[in-house]
Amino acid sequence: VTGSRVYPANEVTLLDSRSVQGELGWIASPLEGGWEEVSIMDEKNTPIRTYQVCNVMEPSQNNWLRTDWITREGAQRVYIEIKFTLRDCNSLPGVMGTCKETFNLYYYESDNDKERFIRENQFVKIDTIAADESFTQVDIGDRIMKLNTEIRDVGPLSKKGFYLAFQDVGACIALVSVRVFYKKCPLTVRNLAQFPDTITGADTSSLVEVRGSCVNNSEEKDVPKMYCGADGEWLVPIGNCLCNAGHEERSGECQACKIGYYKALSTDATCAKCPPHSYSVWEGATSCTCDRGFFRADNDAASMPCTRPPSAPLNLISNVNETSVNLEWSSPQNTGGRQDISYNVVCKKCGAGDPSKCRPCGSGVHYTPQQNGLKTTKVSITDLLAHTNYTFEIWAVNGVSKYNPNPDQSVSVTVTTNQAAPSSIALVQAKEVTRYSVALAWLEPDRPNGVILEYEVKYYEKDQNERSYRIVRTAARNTDIKGLNPLTSYVFHVRARTAAGYGDFSEPLEVTTNTVPSRIIGDGANST
């Protein structure tokens, strides 16, 4: 049974005489008169089992003491630490010729753990041990002892175990403690890679290459390797591991990000606080969830704040100029926390009688600089119809507008374009032709461009070639032209007038009056 004594983490103790409870019971040769096991009290009044010999009066001493079998435990090189006290020969009366101040240390490798006798010739000498000048003074009970510490190493070892032996040649000495240990590079974590307990190499200059394994919740960046030096120190760390997304390095471990923190990638960064307007409710978050009403665009980094669509643009002003409209507005009060704001223009043409019945304006309308993705707060809209109700919506949009289920970020204005001269009348028809009259009818212009005040019919005899013509005005879309000559070709033109003026005349309609008193009904543009 051994008591616990604390030694460096890179040393593995195979034997510690001071930890043994009760007698050590090592083998001495000769059995009597040589090495003797003696119990002394340490500074805590705890008994220490020591071996002493003090045969200083007789020459040619050869007293051997052998330990029990010591297992090697896979170590190729072991270290022997001997704490001993040596009495100066000059403190012993009358022994100058026979007293020595050294002893010898030996070892013998063996697979047999039960060898009963000391066979001196089997042992290999490690060294002659002498009292060092630099001794430690230790309180043993009430007595100050000069305690020397010597460490020797031996290797390479190959058998299952070994025995140590101490040869006294005539010194007055006590072995206060014998400790046998090997060195290992202790289990360690470096650069987030764990390196296992590794026994040092066989010789004092060897380096053992060890591959590390990434700690939990981490992954290799470069293959982690270290070298275990002969002194049990890890050397030259190469490569490393990185904490997985959602984890950060804390105390050599990859620990989950705390609630309210996140880490998006496998990097050496620490977890970051969730960006504004986002949260994480679990440990180990790789991203943070946006607050209600806030969104993250596809190309937004996880580190960016969650944002929301902008509010509606402000202060929309319209300026109508005949069939053009200039619109200007101010930026929204709330941009949603984004810089990528732009504006889209929606144009709707609405009926005068029922403004709710609107339809898209179509492709004939033109926008300067553009209809969608406007970066400025003004737009010019041209090629509108005159005297038409239009509703224009200005939409403020940003990178997250598409995620908003309830858009409310537009402002609208309804305008009516100015009246203009109407377009020409497309179709004029002779409805009834007699010897002396022609009944005309026509359609409203395609684009009245205002309220039609009247229509003007211009006609003349064909052979006069417009040198002499007559004008008839009517508010209706038909008229009877009377007082014509029979069997004569007439040319008719019709135009409409609004408050803005006359439109262009229609294409000519040629009609010939009849010779007989009968009716000729004509649908065409040219009745004969």
């Epitope: 003696v38 003090c54 009066m57 006290t85 040596l86 022994v95 009430d142 007595r143 100050i144 000495i173």
Partner: antibody, heavy 121, light 106 residues
Framework: QVQLLQSGAEVKKPGASVKVPCKAS????????MSWVRQAPGQGLEWMGW????????TYAQGFTGRFVFSLDTSVSTAYLQISSLKAEDTAVYYC??????????????WGQGTLVTVSS | EIVLTQSPATLSVSPGERATLSCRAS??????LAWYQQKPGQAPRLLIY???TRPTGIPDRFSASGSGTDFTLTISRVEPEDFAVYYC????????FGQGTKVEIK
């Protein structure tokens, strides 16, 4: 078993000599020094000195020089105390004791049974 | 010559009690002090050497301490066979004994 065996009691007249033997057994005689201790009747212990059994070199305590001689016969593992010109005040038990040197300290670890020397006219 | 003075001269104790004996040196003897027990009609027996080290075979109820000039021998629980005279002895260049302390039954 380590033993020191001393001779029986001696009665001597003043002026005579006595040689007290101390035979060692159970250990190598020449490996340990031998000490001599006197104890007068009813009194305490008095160290007389010691002899190096390897070299034969004696050391005498104050008051035990001149008439007191330590000697050896290593062939029979025996140490001797010889007192000459005995006086009445030499009446005492004389002990031989093996000297033990250790790294922690010295002491007399094995004692003879003692020889009573009586000096009387 | 170094003089050792033991006290008390006589110590009366009952079996099972603790006994404490003192030895004072006229000058420092470091740890070079031994204790002996002598029973009537017997040779002394070595109890302690080096001020505090017990030889093999000495019961652990005997313990000792001290260095320099003041030394103590303690019998933790006195047994009937412990009633005897106890001597301290210093072994500097010249050895001397104290005058002894008699431990008797109370």
């Amino acid at each position: 078993q380590v033993q020191l065996l001393q001779s029986g009691a001696e009665v001597k007249k003043p002026g005579a000599s006595v040689k007290v033997p101390c035979k060692a057994s159970g250990y190598t005689f020449t490996s340990r020094a031998m000490s001599w201790v006197r104890q007068a009747p009813g009194q305490g212990l008095e160290w007389m000195g010691w002899i190096n059994t390897n070299t034969g070199n004696p050391t005498y305590a104050q008051g035990f020089t001149g008439r007191f001689v330590f000697s050896l016969d290593t062939s029979v593992s025996t140490a001797y105390l010889q007192i000459s010109s005995l006086k009445a005040e030499d009446t005492a038990v004389y002990y031989c004791a093996r000297v033990r040197f250790t790294v922690y300290g010295d002491g007399m670890d094995v004692w003879g049974q003692g020889t009573l020397v009586t000096v009387s006219s | 010559e170094i003089v050792l003075t033991q006290s008390p001269a006589t110590l009366s104790v009952s079996p099972g009690e603790r006994a404490t004996l003192s030895c004072r040196a006229s000058q420092s003897v470091s740890s070079n002090l031994a204790w002996y027990q002598q029973k009537p009609g017997q040779a002394p027996r070595l109890l302690i050497y080096g001020a505090s080290t017990r030889p093999t075979g000495i019961p652990d109820r005997f313990s000792a301490s001290g260095s320099g000039t003041d030394f103590t021998l303690t019998i933790s629980r006195v047994e009937p066979e412990d009633f005897a005279v106890y001597y301290c002895q210093q072994y500097g260049p010249s050895w001397t004994f104290g005058q002894g302390t008699k431990v008797e039954i109370k």
